[in-house]
């Protein structure tokens, strides 16, 4: 599984590299990591009180 640069400390690591489809780049640790799918719920029907909070699909455990 391709991850990202491995040899450098967190504060010195290079810019993001492409990740495999099930992963995304974590700017904090400068590595490709497992990622779930982010989703924004459909807007509520007219007259609904407040906008639905944004949620996410959990990463595969």
């Amino acid at each position: 599984m391709r991850r990202g640069p491995r040899s450098l400390r967190g504060r010195d690591a290079p810019a993001p590299t492409p990740c495999v489809p099930a992963e995304c780049f974590d700017l904090l640790v400068r590595h490709c990591v497992a990622c779930g799918l982010l989703r924004t719920p459909r807007p509520k029907p007219a007259g609904a009180s407040s906008p639905a909070p944004r949620t996410a699909l959990q990463p595969q455990e």
């Epitope: 040899s7 504060r11 995304c24 974590d26 990591v33 990622c35 779930g36 982010l38």
Partner: antibody, heavy 125, light 107 residues
Framework: EVQLVESGGGLVQPGGSLRLSCAAS????????IHWVRQAPGKGLEWVAW????????DYADSVKGRFTISADTSKNTAYLQMNSLRAEDTAVYYC??????????????????WGQGTLVTVSS | DIQMTQSPSSLSASVGDRVTITCRAS??????VAWYQQKPGKAPKLLIY???FLYSGVPSRFSGSGSGTDFTLTISSLQPEDFATYYC?????????FGQGTKVEIK
């Protein structure tokens, strides 16, 4: 069920060493970065260290740099925090936590979603 | 390192109140801010990540907003179980740093 269980805390004299363990179940630590966060009695949260999924990269808070070492053993699905040259100010509850990521345009949007129950480290003579 | 400054450090509120906690970063962190709730003797719980995304299972009365340097956690109608300490954390640049916490107490 995702779970993190810390162990290894206890009472140690100044200058001593301890190794904390963080055993993960319900997910593989090779998929997420693992972090140690501590909380001194009556104080706020202080991040201590992280290790990347591959175990190849680490980073440390300035307060522990050169004294603490974080590592991960993917075969045991366990992360470790080796603490040397302990000081009174290292007294705290130590938590390990998993950083979860969601894909936002190829970049992680996330936070620390699962935490262990904490293990108390007391440094005192 | 990036400093995260929370305000207020504590507040007193009643059940049903709308509560707002703010967090200011010492430099631009985009939307890489999470909010946690902690009760005495317990581990923190993730509420909000990426500034405005509600974590799974968290009640919708919690919401987050902001980007750049200024961030807000809002509890729309405070419930008895919400009395706790709340922390912000930036994860844009290592080391990830926490705010000093805001204790929400019963008025």
């Amino acid at each position: 069920e995702v779970q993190l269980v810390e162990s290894g805390g206890g009472l140690v004299q100044p200058g001593g060493s301890l190794r904390l363990s963080c055993a993960a179940s319900g997910f593989t630590i090779s998929s997420n970065s693992i972090h140690w966060v501590r909380q001194a009695p009556g104080k706020g949260l202080e991040w201590v260290a992280w290790v990347t999924p591959s175990g190849g990269s680490t980073d440390y808070a300035d307060s522990v740099k050169g004294r603490f070492t974080i590592s991960a053993d993917t075969s045991k699905n366990t992360a470790y925090l080796q603490m040397n040259s302990l000081r009174a100010e290292d007294t705290a509850v130590y938590y390990c936590a998993r950083r979860v990521c969601y894909n936002r345009l190829g970049v992680c949007a996330g936070g620390m979603d699962y935490w262990g129950q904490g293990t108390l480290v007391t440094v005192s003579s | 390192d990036i400093q995260m400054t929370q305000s207020p450090s504590s507040l007193s509120a009643s059940v049903g109140d709308r509560v707002t906690i703010t967090c200011r970063a010492s430099q631009d962190v985009s939307t890489a801010v999470a909010w946690y709730q902690q009760k005495p003797g317990k581990a923190p719980k993730l509420l909000i990540y990426s500034a405005s995304f509600l974590y799974s299972g968290v009640p919708s009365r919690f919401s987050g907003s902001g980007s750049g340097t200024d961030f807000t956690l809002t509890i729309s109608s405070l419930q008895p179980e919400d009395f706790a300490t709340y922390y912000c954390q930036q994860s844009r640049i290592s080391p990830p740093t926490f705010g000093q916490g805001t204790k929400v107490e019963i008025k």
